[in-house]
Amino acid sequence: PLATIPVSTTSLTSSEGSTISTPSVDISTPVTTSIVGDQCSRCKNGGFWDGLKCQCLTPYYGESCEEVVNSIDIAPPETVSAQMELTVTVTSVKFTDELKNHSSQEFREFNKTFTEQMNIVYSGIPEYVGVNITNLRLGSVVVEHDVLLRTKYTPEYKTALDNATEVVKQKITKVTTEQIMTNDNCSALMCFNTTGTQVQNITVTQYDPVEECRQKAEEYEDYFLVEYRDQKPYCISPCESGFNASKNCNHGKCQMSQNGARCLCVTTETHWYSGEDCNQGTQKSHHHHHH
């Protein structure tokens, strides 16, 4: 049964011109009714009755989950990160078998010295978090490691992380060219083999607010869009006010349907309103107001 209970006596006229009587139910929305126990809950669009009220699925709301929300919560991560897989060759330390064992004192000491050296190298990069040695091997010591970068999420986060990875490449190239052995001795904290520096791989956090917005909007994906305010993304329909894409319904109410946003125009005591944006007013004739 698809019976509805009117909850409002407002008379609305659709932009096509026909008058419709409405509770706030979108008659074009496909509905499915959820029945739990003996309780015909009238929870539509996949909503379910929790014993007190309908629990609606995004993007629906209302007593019977019959209306479509104007905005959907999307939560970008607070921070985004990049991981660079690098290899450098340290020439000022000779490889010993103990370095293979990550729990050995030798490995811990090497890890500490290498981390200190890399902290110095990358000290001017605000996105730099640290290094993580993944493997040490012979030659003198070939150090396979990750350089970790992190930044606050902004719409331009990819550019920020891409720039940071470029600076990492420049700085590691510079230090491994400058800090080299002279007469079999190293005067720096660590010395390197210039030719042993390689960037194997770069992985950047993938977050697309548009994609999240479209997924959450489900069958309304074509009508929801992302707009930014204070660098924060908002997933909105044109019925959400205060954004560039907001639909102005003037003398009417914006409502989402599967064909997009439309204006339901009001009829007042003195005027009929019509038009796509309910901006065409027709005065009712022979009507007098007495104050």
């Epitope: 000022s92 330390v93 000779k94 030798e106 010295t113 001795n185 190293c186 720096a188 010395c191």
Partner: nanobody, 123 residues
Framework: DVQLQASGGGLVQPGGSLRLSCAAS????????MAWFRQAPGKEREGVAF???????SYAESVKGRFTISRDNALSSLYLQMNSLRAEDTAVYYC?????????????????WGQGTMVTVSS
């Protein structure tokens, strides 16, 4: 826990000799690198010499041919034989160690340090 104890410093005349010792406890004597550093009044700490587990040695240019570094793995000790001493050798001498086979006299590469012993070369 690694502990280093330096000794043997003193007052000596120019051209004289001294032998510094460094006793290491908790340090795997057959591994890593041991070194001598010095710091003259008002100057930066500088590397004097280091010796690796396999006996490989390296010296600062200013002491080459005059100083000899050696280690006794059985006694877990490090030595610095200093001959033909000069006034500019006056400094506090420190022994240092690393578990790694190092080829650097950069002080920051050595995590373990002994307290200093004072060497004064004066007539």
């Amino acid at each position: 826990d690694v502990q280093l104890q330096a000794s043997g410093g003193g007052l000596v005349q120019p051209g004289g000799s001294l032998r510094l010792s460094c006793a290491a406890s908790g340090f795997p004597s057959s591994r890593g690198t041991m070194a001598w550093f010095r710091q003259a009044p008002g100057k930066e700490r500088e590397g004097v010499a280091f010796i690796n587990s396999d006996g490989r040695t390296s010296y600062a240019e200013s002491v080459k041919g005059r100083f000899t570094i050696s280690r006794d793995n059985a006694l877990s000790s490090l030595y610095l034989q200093m001959n033909s001493l000069r006034a500019e050798d006056t400094a506090v001498y420190y022994c240092a160690a690393s578990l790694l086979y190092l080829m650097t006299v950069n002080a920051a590469a050595y995590p373990y340090w002994g307290q200093g012993t004072m060497v004064t070369v004066s007539s």
